[in-house]
């Protein structure tokens, strides 16, 4: 039987806003990853910032509702925004426990499907919400 959806929870320092209210943090002590049990959906999300060849996780947690993409078993990120020149935000949604812990792959910058250099620009804090 299904359990309430549980996702990896992470918010990078300096990220504006929080998705903590979309679930209940499990008491994992000092262990990483932290885990969050979703309150309003059965869907996890992840956001990664790809700069040159380095991907850095920005946020992981629960979505506020079940939307297209949430039926995916794995985290397959797609490009969403350019927070600054040379960096691209990739987001995924998926619907299995801890599926947002890692992405299956990131397309290389500039590959088909990546927004062009005139794609959406955003200040660092705002980019997260644009991606969500």
């Amino acid at each position: 039987p299904p359990n309430r959806r549980t996702c990896v929870f992470f918010e990078a320092p300096g990220v504006r806003g929080s998705t903590k209210t979309l679930g209940e943090l499990l008491d994992t002590g000092t262990e990483l990853p932290r885990a969050i049990r979703c309150l309003y959906s059965r869907c996890c999300f992840g956001i990664w910032n790809l700069t040159q060849d380095r991907a850095q996780v920005e946020m992981q947690g629960c979505r506020d509702s079940d939307e297209p993409g949430c039926e995916s078993l794995h985290c397959d990120p797609s490009p969403r925004a350019h927070p600054s020149p040379g960096s691209t935000l990739f987001t995924c949604s998926c619907g299995t426990d801890f599926c947002n812990a890692n992405y299956s792959h990131l397309p290389p910058p500039g590959s088909p499907g990546t927004p062009g250099s005139q794609g959406p620009q955003a200040a660092p804090g705002e980019s997260i919400w644009m991606a969500l």
């Epitope: 039987p1 299904p2 359990n3 959806r5 994992t28 885990a35 309150l39 959906s41 801890f98």
Partner: antibody
């Protein structure tokens, strides 16, 4: 087919600890929570807690925090539960389950001096 | 903790009878994601519990269609249209909506 094979019965002294195992087969061990359930003699069932084998994250019934420790060994596809500071109240049958759909045969723990 | 009260506590039946078991929760079991995490189990004498229904009315594989699960909110029912010998044992409802997860008090089904 999915199978959960639990270790044998245990007779332990008060104050001691008991560790039981639950070996999984027939499915991807890391994809499902393993839950543990207590059944005291002639009584209903109590949910102890659960562990996600892929990352070891646990979720406990507060009542059993400090009493039960849940661990896994991914290499042998085995989940473990250790019960500490045993008293007569801990005498029961303990079941492991794969997210409650398939159940092990149970382990009878008897605490007696 | 959420209390699940089952009625009746025991039930003596004749083979072929229709029976109904009630499970009443002290809180609503509908979760914020819209799903109701209510399950039914049968524990036959000397055996481990076995899953019958999840999500109130979703029949687990191999469960005969003479079993029907229904209900919402705080009131749930398990019906057996024609009792057969292999149906005897103790029935438990279970909720995974609230922490800690809890089982019902149990309903023992035996022969008259």
């Amino acid at each position: 087919q999915v199978r959960l094979l639990q270790s044998g019965a245990a007779l332990v002294k008060p104050g001691a600890s008991a560790k039981m195992s639950c070996k999984a087969s027939g499915y991807t061990f890391t994809d499902y929570w393993v839950s543990w359930v207590k059944q005291s003699h002639g009584k209903s069932l109590e949910w102890i807690g659960e562990i996600y084998p892929d990352n070891g994250i646990t979720n406990f019934n507060e009542k059993f925090k400090g009493k039960a420790t849940l661990t896994v060994d991914k290499s042998t596809r085995t989940a473990y539960m250790e019960l500490s500071r045993l008293t007569s109240e801990d005498s029961a049958i303990y079941y492991c389950t794969r997210q409650r759909d398939y159940w092990g045969q149970g382990v009878m723990v008897t605490v007696s001096s | 903790d959420v209390v699940l009260t089952q009625t009746p506590g025991s039930l003596s039946v004749t083979l072929g009878d229709q029976v109904s078991i009630s499970c009443r929760s002290s809180q609503s079991l509908k979760y914020g994601d819209g799903y109701t995490y209510l399950e039914w189990y049968l524990q036959k004498p000397g055996q481990s519990p076995q899953l019958l229904f999840y999500g109130v009315s979703n029949r687990f594989s191999g469960v005969p269609d003479r079993f029907i699960g229904s209900g919402s909110g705080t009131d749930f029912t398990l019906k057996i249209s024609r009792v057969e010998p292999e149906d005897l044992g103790v029935y438990y409802c279970f909720q995974a909506t609230h922490d800690p997860n809890t089982f019902g008090t149990g309903t023992k089904l035996d022969l008259k």
